[in-house]
Amino acid sequence: ASTGETPNLGEVVVAEVGWDALKLNWTAPEGAYEYFFIQVQEADTVEAAQNLTVPGGLRSTDLPGLKAATHYTITIRGVTQDFSTTPLSVEVLTASGLNDIFEAQKIEWHEGTHHHHHH
């Protein structure tokens, strides 16, 4: 396993919002991660988060299969060789209907300042 510092992610932005899907963009150092681990959690519910991963070379992904007019918290981490970054989160409200598709309604995003070393 790598013993070097794992660089943190930059910023995460919801680029497009639809009624049942959205597009997530983020920034990260080139070549730093094997993949990104993304969790999509419906707010105010005990339902399990939707988990997915994206290859480390990508900086955006579509997130399908969401509910209309629903608040979600989306968390992203960069992962490489036994390391994971501090999670970066964004909250979003999906559109209320088929025709109500609009540019990013990003409520907030926040990041930690240290990487996590998993033992």
Epitope: Q50, L52, G56, T61, P64, V79
Partner: antibody, heavy 121, light 107 residues
Framework: QVQLVQSGAEVKKPGSSVKVSCKAS????????ISWVRQAPGQGLEWMGG????????NYAQKFQGRVTITADKSTSTAYMELSSLRSEDTAVYYC??????????????WGQGTTVTVSS | DIQMTQSPSSLSASVGDRVTITCRAS??????LGWYQQKPGKAPKRLIY???SLQSGVPSRFSGGGSGTEFTLTISSLQPEDFATYYC?????????FGQGTKVEIK
């Protein structure tokens, strides 16, 4: 070269539990997902669940929710699948696998040799 | 869970035939869709990943296509060694799901 080596065949009584192990060697264990897939005699492949050891939390297919528990021990590079309340329909070959698309983007998929679980009274 | 409906469940074909197998997802999925070939008593073997990328070492007669909810595996000219069972797997959204399988038999 990654190898996934599973525990041996099991014969179980209905209502009991079985725990199958899958030891990984030849590569990083913690950051790559391990899935469990089963195949009953003459039937298709069923994805049961999977885990990324570095995060610890597992995903389960709805069909097995509440009856299956998938865990991973990073210190021994071993994943486990425990299935409870066994019935005859659970008689199958159980595979652990590293499958492309979720926390793994390697050139090849890797499969364990399979563990036959027979449920019979 | 996302349902993957695979069709047909079985088909009979001759050597040299063009064969197409379809997988339909119950909702839009990311294109993390793989196709696997399985022969009796063996573990499955990946043929296609990311819906259309050919696995290294797999003959070019195999091809994949589709996006969103509908995906296809095509064998352009069936060979004797291709008689097997084929499965699709969506592994882009958890929990992952296999299709029910398509058994390709000799006519």
């Amino acid at each position: 070269q990654v190898q996934l080596v599973q525990s041996g065949a099991e014969v179980k009584k209905p209502g009991s539990s079985v725990k199958v192990s899958c030891k990984a060697s030849g590569g990083t264990f913690s950051s790559y997902a391990i899935s469990w897939v089963r195949q009953a005699p003459g039937q298709g492949l069923e994805w049961m669940g999977g885990i990324i050891p570095i995060f610890g939390t597992a995903n389960y297919a709805q069909k097995f929710q509440g009856r299956v528990t998938i865990t991973a021990d990073k210190s021994t590079s071993t994943a486990y699948m425990e299935l409870s309340s066994l019935r005859s329909e659970d008689t199958a070959v159980y595979y652990c696998a590293r499958l492309y698309g979720y926390a793994y983007y390697g050139a090849f998929d890797y499969w364990g040799q399979g563990t036959t679980v027979t449920v019979s009274s | 869970d996302i349902q993957m409906t695979q069709s047909p469940s079985s088909l009979s074909a001759s050597v040299g035939d063009r064969v197409t197998i379809t997988c339909r997802a119950s909702q839009g999925i990311r294109n993390v869709l793989g196709w696997y070939q399985q022969k009796p008593g063996k573990a499955p073997k990946r043929l296609i990943y990311d819906s259309s990328s050919l696995q290294s070492g797999v003959p070019s007669r195999f091809s994949g296509g589709g996006s969103g909810t509908e995906f296809t595996l095509t064998i352009s000219s069936l060979q004797p060694e291709d008689f097997a069972t084929y499965y699709c797997l969506q592994n882009g959204l958890q929990p992952a799901t296999f299709g029910q399988g398509t058994k390709v038999e000799i006519k």
